[in-house]
Every structure is written in C-alpha cells, then in structure tokens.
C-alpha cells in the first residue's frame, strides 16, 4: 500500500507492519447514487451471450451472498434465435474483495480475501489453433 | 448481517451494534489459485462488444487501483468488422466493496464502501420504445 503520513486525529494502531490489522466501519457508504439498477437488470436475457445468475451463499463471508454468472450457451445467439457455434459465449470475470470471518464464526474479526467472480458473459471470436 | 454466536476465542469488541467497527487483517488470502488470468485477458479485443480498460486510481481507497471498462462502440462488431448499429454494446456493471480511509489519510482506519464498476461489455438487442 501507499505510505501515507498518519494524522494526529487518526485512531491509534499498534501494528504498522504488513500483515496489518485495521479498523473497518461496516456502515457501508454507497457511492452509486445516480445509477438506476433496473437499466442493466435484463442484459442477462437480451445479450447475444445470455447468462443465468446463481446464488452463492456463505455466512462466514461478507457479503454473504454473491451472484455468479454462468453462460447459457457455448456459442452466441444469432438474430433468428439459433446458436452460432462459430462464436463463443465466455464469462467476464473480476477479482473482488470480500471479508472472511477469521477465526471462524467471530462476528467482529475478519481477513480480506480476494475471490474471482463471473459477472456476465460476452460473445467472442474463438481462437483458431492451426493443426501442425 | 447474519447473527452468529461469538466464540470464546474471538477478539474482544466493544460495539456490537451497526454501524459496527470490526478488525480486518489486510494480509489478503487469494482463493483464485487455479485460475489462469491470461484466459480472459484478450476478451476485451475479441468480443463483438469490445472495450478499453481505464485505470482509476485513488490513494484513499483500498484497492487503490481499479480498472474500468468503457465500450468502444455504441453498436456491436459484425463478422466483417463493421459495426452493427441495430445491436448495442453495453457495460456489465457490478457493485464491489472497497475500503475508504476514514478519517482521510489514516493508514489504519477504514469504512466499507460500495462502488459500481464496469467490468466488460456485452452485446444486447436494443429496447424499442414506441413513438407516441
């Protein structure tokens, strides 16, 4: 992380070294005030690479519920509704941060964890591997 | 959050109410051991709704660098390389959790924050609004 001089008004902290334990306020501030969640809510159905959303729940994690996209087809949907297998539906994946209760079941102690989630799908031209 | 009985081995915590302040170990555990990041690294170019990645940096945030996708076209790219305006490239957005330094510049005190990021783009059939 970037070294930032500590303000005199900062909460005291014993351990300045990594791995460091920090105080986190779980009262979430939501920056997405201007976004309309309904806008993109049906892309999973309208896409040429449609996907289904699967609920992944883990009470030891924060957030406990994460939605995972699974592409419906191997190919992409054409104008006539049929699947074109000369194109590929692939998941767009993103690494996200979650909080993992550590030790387990402790309500006030967490460790940051990186997990890879599939957010949606996109239609790509397949890579052609030439036969030697 | 889900109420979980506290173990006797859990770190002590004064405030059990929301907004609650918790201890978080920033030594990130990475669960993505089996994933190959190169697999999806070129989807942004091979997609029918290609995108560019823009670096969003904020030293007051953890992680300080987030990559934002911006669709290259309004339409989608056809097999011949031309753009089809009767389909739309749209960003797939996801709400993610980040840590925001609070008070500002404090190295050991954070607040959880939700931000909306565009992860990639997908090609969708446009919504037809009937002309009044």
């Amino acid at each position: 992380g970037i070294a930032i001089p500590r303000n005199s008004g900062c909460p005291n902290s014993e351990d300045k070294n990594f791995p460091r334990t920090v105080m986190v306020n779980l009262n979430i501030h939501n920056r997405n005030t201007s976004t309309n969640p309904k806008r993109s809510s049906d892309y999973y159905n309208r896409s040429t690479s449609p996907w289904n959303l699967h609920r992944n729940e883990d009470p030891e994690r924060y957030p406990s519920v994460i939605w995972e996209a699974k592409c419906r087809h191997l190919g992409c949907v054409k104008a006539d509704g049929n699947v074109d297998y000369h194109m590929n539906s692939v998941p767009i994946q993103q690494e996200i941060l979650v909080l993992r209760r550590e030790p387990r079941h402790c309500p006030n102690s967490f460790r940051l964890e990186k997990i890879l989630v599939s957010v949606g799908c996109t239609c790509v031209t397949p890579i052609v591997h030439h036969v030697a | 959050g889900i109420a979980i009985p506290r173990n006797s081995g859990c770190p002590n915590s004064e405030d059990k109410n929301f907004p609650r302040t918790v201890m978080v170990n920033l030594n990130i555990h990475n669960r993505n051991t089996s994933t190959n990041p190169k697999r999806s690294s070129d989807y942004y170019n091979r997609s029918t709704s290609p995108w560019n990645l823009h670096r969003n940096e904020d030293p007051e945030r953890y992680p300080s660098v987030i990559w934002e996708a911006k669709c290259r076209h309004l339409g989608c790219v056809k097999a011949d390389g031309n753009v089809d305006y009767h389909m739309n490239s749209v960003p797939i957005q996801q709400e993610i959790l980040v840590l925001r330094r609070e008070p500002r510049h404090c190295p050991n005190s954070f607040r959880l924050e939700k931000i909306l990021v565009s992860v990639g783009c997908t090609c969708v059939t446009p919504i037809v609004h009937h002309v009044a």
């Epitope: 104008a79 | 911006k70 076209h73 031309n82 753009v83 305006y85 009767h86 739309n88 490239s89 002309v131």
Partner: antibody
Framework: QVQLVQSGAEVKKPGSSVKVSCKAS????????ISWVRQAPGQGLEWMGV????????DYNQRFKGRVTITADESTSTAYMELSSLRSEDTAVYYC????????????WGQGTLVTVSS | DIVMTQTPLSLSVTPGQPASISCRSS???????????LHWYLQKPGQSPQLLIY???NRFIGVPDRFSGSGSGTDFTLKISRVEAEDVGVYYC?????????FGQGTKLEIK
C-alpha cells in the same frame, strides 16, 4: 412534446474548435440515442456520429474520426458535438436528431446551428 | 460507405398531379434481423429535415396518406399521389442499415 433545442450560430477561425449543444426535453433522455448530421450550404446531409447518453458510448463516421467528439450530460439532458481543427469546408448547419429503434432513424431534429469557419 | 443515388434530382409538378422519386443503394439495405432501414425525409426551405417514411413504407406520425413508400433490397420509391403546394422542398432518402448512415443527394420538388 419532444424538443431538441440547439445552441446559437458560431463564427470560428480555421484550426480552432467548435462545440455545439443540443438540449433535449419531453422524453427520458437516456432512452434514446442522439445523432449528429451536418449540411454544408446548398449541399446534402452528412451523418457525423451518434451517442448513447446512458453510457456515453459513441460511434463516428470515419470521415470525421479524430476530429469529432460527441458527449452527453445526463444531468442537463444535453448532448454536445465538438469538431476540432476546423477548416473552411466545415462551414455548415449542424443538426442533432433523436434516434429511436422503433422508426430505425432520426425522427425528431433540432433546429440546426450554423457554424461559419472563416479567417 | 453505402452510396445512395436519387433520381430525378429535380421535379416540377402541377398541384393535384402525382410525383415519384427513386432511390437506389449500392448495397442491399436488408438487415440480418429482417428489417430494411430505408427512410425518406422532406426538408422544407429554411427548416430542419422532417421524417416522412421510415423502414421503407411506414408513414411517420402526422404524415398525410398521399405519401407512400415502397421497394426492397437496393431499389426504393417515394410516391406522392396528389402533390400540394406545401410539399415543396428537398426530399432525401436515407439508410441506417449500415455504418456510416448515408443520405441520397436530394430531389428538389417545385410546383408548376
């Protein structure tokens, strides 16, 4: 009713830039795309590009690529067209038009903005 | 780019008489999703273009039924069954099937 109101006439020097605005009203700004079309004096119509105001995604006529930038401000329901490196041949009336997928074209047009490029 | 060629370039018609304008595209305007995005506009003197016909044959709101459009593929026609004085101006065909969208060079209609 649907209205697109454009900014006033401009006189510009060769090599400079011009930014024309198009304020939309009477409908939900992010539901429709905005196209820009120009018409040189006594000439026909030439399509310049289009924007999806919801996400700011654009596509341009390659003839103008690199010189034209189309943007939109959702908070004021206004679209903008900026043309740089102006030359005398860019003297024209510039129109914005609301594109909809029902008609498949620009059904409602602004009143036009005359841009004169002269030294 | 798709080239749109209109004929004739000018037309002088007696009120009450029919008029016909032809438009030919350099490539088929039928989209893979089935529609043909060929449209007709009228630009009256000193005004912005106004949509008359969209997708070959559909009259836009408020357009009199004396205007009709027809055609397919690369050949299209705009017909005015009985020309009126208010119909004067320049008529443009336009395609939005292919990028970039293009217009015909225009047909000027005058009243005799």
């Amino acid at each position: 009713q649907v209205q697109l109101v454009q900014s006033g006439a401009e006189v510009k020097k060769p090599g400079s830039s011009v930014k024309v605005s198009c304020k939309a009203s009477g409908y939900s700004f992010t539901d429709y795309h905005i196209s820009w079309v120009r018409q040189a004096p006594g000439q026909g119509l030439e399509w310049m590009g289009v924007i999806n105001p919801e996400y700011g995604t654009t596509d341009y006529n390659q003839r103008f690529k690199g010189r034209v930038t189309i943007t939109a401000d959702e908070s004021t329901s206004t679209a903008y067209m900026e043309l740089s490196s102006l030359r005398s041949e860019d003297t024209a009336v510039y129109y914005c038009a609301r594109y909809d997928y029902f008609t498949g074209t620009g059904a409602y047009w602004g009143q036009g903005t005359l841009v004169t490029v002269s030294s | 780019d798709i080239v749109m060629t209109q004929t004739p370039l000018s037309l002088s018609v007696t009120p009450g008489q029919p008029a016909s304008i032809s438009c030919r595209s350099s490539q088929s305007l039928k989209h893979s999703r089935g529609n043909t995005f060929l449209h007709w506009y009228l630009q009256k003197p000193g005004q912005s273009p106004q949509l008359l016909i969209y997708k070959v044959s559909n009259r836009f709101i408020g357009v009199p039924d004396r205007f009709s459009g027809s055609g397919s593929g690369t050949d299209f026609t705009l017909k005015i069954s009985r020309v009126e004085a208010e119909d004067v101006g320049v008529y443009y065909c336009s395609q939005s099937t292919h990028y970039p969208f293009t217009f015909g060079q225009g047909t000027k209609l005058e009243i005799k």
